[in-house]
């Protein structure tokens, strides 16, 4: 038989037990609060630095693009792709149709002031997208030229000129003096490319990479 404890001893044991429980609770709370602080501070710092980076990136573009239209890329809330607000987007690029009539060189300079180039068309899909925004009774400069007049066509961004991925109208190019390319509509062939004089004012299409923030 277990001897009965003295009341004094019982109180002492109870007090010791309570102390252990309380100290465990306090330690647990401390640990939890540390964990909570760490878990909120780390992402907060991460988010803060990402925001700072975004702001500085946006500031870069703000001089010629005061507003951007951004969409979430994939499922990650932190990755956005943007195009300047009046521009349209397709795949990884942004496009702008310039309705001012200018020479090829001036058109390219204007695109470059906006951080872009005259459009380089790499695929049929890209051309199909672009023509949705064009007017049939207009012609638009492309970023394609032959400054030497020797039929050595070159893209403004140095993309290699691939004869297999060209969309010239039939019979074009047809004049060594016509050293710049436009895209225009012909009722017989729909949309295609034509060579014209570079100094003749035309509308134009600018293209730039999407801005990722």
């Amino acid at each position: 038989m277990v001897p009965e404890e003295e009341p004094q001893d019982r109180e002492k044991g109870l007090w010791w037990f309570q102390l252990k429980v309380w100290s465990m609770a306090v330690v647990s709370i401390l640990l939890l609060s540390v964990c909570f602080t760490v878990s909120s501070v780390v992402p907060h710092n991460f988010m803060y630095s990402k925001t700072v980076k975004r702001l500085s990136k946006l500031r870069e573009y703000q001089q010629y693009h005061p507003s951007l239209t951004c969409v979430m890329e994939g499922k990650d809330i932190e990755d956005w792709s943007c195009c300047p607000t009046p521009w349209t987007s397709f795949q990884s690029s942004c496009y702008f149709i310039s309705t001012g009539m200018q020479s090829w060189t001036k058109s390219q300079k204007n695109c470059s002031v906006m951080g872009a180039d005259l459009v380089v068309i790499n695929t049929r899909e890209e051309q199909d997208f672009i023509i949705q925004n064009l007017k049939r009774n207009s012609s638009y400069f492309l970023g394609l030229s032959d400054p030497g007049g020797r039929r050595h066509w070159q893209w403004v961004d140095q993309t290699p000129y691939n004869e297999n991925v060209t969309f010239w109208h039939s019979g074009e190019p047809n004049n060594l003096d016509e050293r710049c390319a436009i895209i225009n509509f012909r009722s017989s062939e729909e949309w295609g490319w034509n060579d014209i004089h570079c100094h003749v004012p035309q509308k134009s299409i600018c293209k730039m990479k999407k801005i990722y923030i």
């Epitope: 060189t105 007049g149 004049n175 003096d177 570079c198 100094h199 003749v200």
Partner: antibody, heavy 121, light 111 residues
Framework: EVQLVESGGGLVKPGGSLRLSCAAS????????MSWVRQAPGKGLEWVAT????????YYPDSVKGRFTISRDNAKNSLYLQMNSLRAEDTAVYYC??????????????WGQGTTVTVSS | DIVLTQSPASLAVSPGQRATITCRAS??????????MHWYQQKPGQPPKLLIY???NLESGVPARFSGSGSGTDFTLTINPVEANDAANYYC?????????FGGGTKVEIK
Amino acid sequence: EVQLVESGGGLVKPGGSLRLSCAASGFTFSSYGMSWVRQAPGKGLEWVATISSGDSYTYYPDSVKGRFTISRDNAKNSLYLQMNSLRAEDTAVYYCARQLYYSYGYYFDYWGQGTTVTVSS
Amino acid sequence: DIVLTQSPASLAVSPGQRATITCRASESVSFHGTHLMHWYQQKPGQPPKLLIYAASNLESGVPARFSGSGSGTDFTLTINPVEANDAANYYCQQSIEDPPTFGGGTKVEIK
């Protein structure tokens, strides 16, 4: 030898018409863009009209747009300038000039001797 | 339109001396290293004659006394040394875009 010979100039009353011609020889006329450039008495040079080699493109300054028409006949090696609704300020020597393309632009490498147009009542 | 301003309007030079004519464009006439400014000489009663194309290229048959330089908006025609038969009007012309425009001309007189 490249030669450009203008003709058709003369005295005409304001509101009248005149047709200038330029006969080209010594080069493959159909392969070159051509222009008309004029020079008023004691003044500088002023471009008046351009036509591309393939006849696909014509261009004029605002001062003559709607009044002057440039054309060519490659079979006859000839360039023309039809001038209607003539004004006193159109008085000038009119030169026919051949364009030679260089990079994204061009220059005038051969000029005719010019033909004089006087618009006066 | 691109406006070309020539200076001086006239100058008198002694034979054997250097003559320098400048042409300033209201905007750049250069693109990727190509300068679309050209120079012509016109003697009284004659048509203009091409001297220099694309800023610095001497036209065939033109004496090496003539030279051109410049880029962007500022271009120079130099005659060195000047000879008596260089008395003429000199014009610059740009062709980077339509309309092609000419400078107002510089009259070179020989002392």
